[in-house]
Amino acid sequence: KAMHVAQPAVVLASSRGIASFVCEYASPGKATEVRVTVLRQADSQVTEVCAATYMMGNELTFLDDSICTGTSSGNQVNLTIQGLRAMDTGLYICKVELMYPPPYYLGIGNGTQIYVIDPEPCPDSDF
């Protein structure tokens, strides 16, 4: 029983450096505890952006200093990443793990390419 994870192919961050996307998984079991990890892949380097473990029916709780926030609804997780700049453009991959009860299942999405464009500085206004 493989666990399929779906996420959008492309997302454009807002001018304020905020990007949101949905990570949806087809659960092969009746999990009560799920861990979601966002991984960024750029230039063959992989970094963990953020991770949260949540009980089904409860909210995701990321660490206080995390750049991610999120909400869950059934087998769907709505993820928001903030504080993004142009240099953060890359492939953001959703990894889902069904932690409890056993058996454990792993699912990895194909990734969401997030494009971040730094806003142009406002020209000085003469009054």
């Epitope: 029983k1 493989a2 991984l39 992989v46 932690m99 056993p102 454990y104 299942y105 792993l106 699912g107």
Partner: antibody, heavy 119, light 106 residues
């Protein structure tokens, strides 16, 4: 650099207990799934147990469920495998291994510690 | 539990030859890894995700396959490649290994 060092192996009689340790350096245990894999003499690899991230969730192979217990000391960055009611078939080299970023393949292994259960 | 069956049990080849190792799963597998183990040593990760080479692994090692059939190929055997090779699935617990294929010098 990442390093895993096991200790605590030895010869023990059937029914007795033993505690194995795995000292980790070069990374933080709580960021990874940490596994024990064993190998009986001249045999293949067998997964034994895993302790996940925050340490609350643990999974065990059916062959050791109820007899083996995993724990972790974050302050020492050390993993423990408490083995009770040992049997002759538990005789093996026990390896501590780190799960990878993309899942529970094992990207780093310790050198192993030999446990011999014999009367 | 997913059972992995490796074939052949032993492969007798000469340095410079191509080695093809097979791993067949009892049911569809999403995530598969390959390891190399030499006598008296811990296993070493070669391939994860069926085809991604681990850090520092020479490009003569390649992995392929999906579903129930996977292959590890060593394009040109070097003297240090003679060892036992294991496949492992990690998509669901319990994590399982194949019984191993020994690549020996002919």
């Amino acid at each position: 650099q990442v390093q895993l060092v096991e200790s605590g192996g030895g010869v023990v009689q059937p029914g007795r207990s033993l505690r194995l340790s795995c000292a980790a350096s070069g990374f933080t245990l709580s960021n990874y799934g940490m596994h024990w894999v064993r190998q009986a003499p001249g045999k293949g690899l067998e997964w034994v147990a895993v302790i996940w991230y925050d340490g609350r969730n643990k999974h065990y192979a059916d062959s050791v469920e109820g007899r083996f217990t995993l724990s972790r000391d974050n302050s020492k960055n050390t993993l423990y495998l408490q083995m009770n009611s040992l049997r002759a078939e538990d005789t093996a080299v026990y390896y501590c291994a780190r799960g990878g970023v993309w899942g529970s393949y094992f990207d780093y292994w310790g050198q192993g510690t030999l446990v011999t259960v014999s009367s | 539990e997913i059972v992995l069956t490796q074939s052949p049990g032993t492969l007798s080849l000469s340095p410079g030859e191509r080695a093809t190792l097979s791993c067949r799963a009892s049911q569809s597998v999403s995530y598969l890894a390959w390891y190399q183990q030499k006598p008296g040593q811990a296993p070493r990760l070669l391939i994860y995700g069926a085809s991604s080479r681990a850090t520092g692994i020479p490009d003569r090692f390649s992995g392929s396959g999906s579903g129930t059939d996977f292959t590890l190929t060593i394009s040109r055997l070097e003297p240090e490649d003679f060892a036992v090779y294991y496949c492992q699935q990690y998509g669901s617990s319990p994590w399982t290994f194949g019984q191993g294929t020994k690549v020996e010098i002919k």
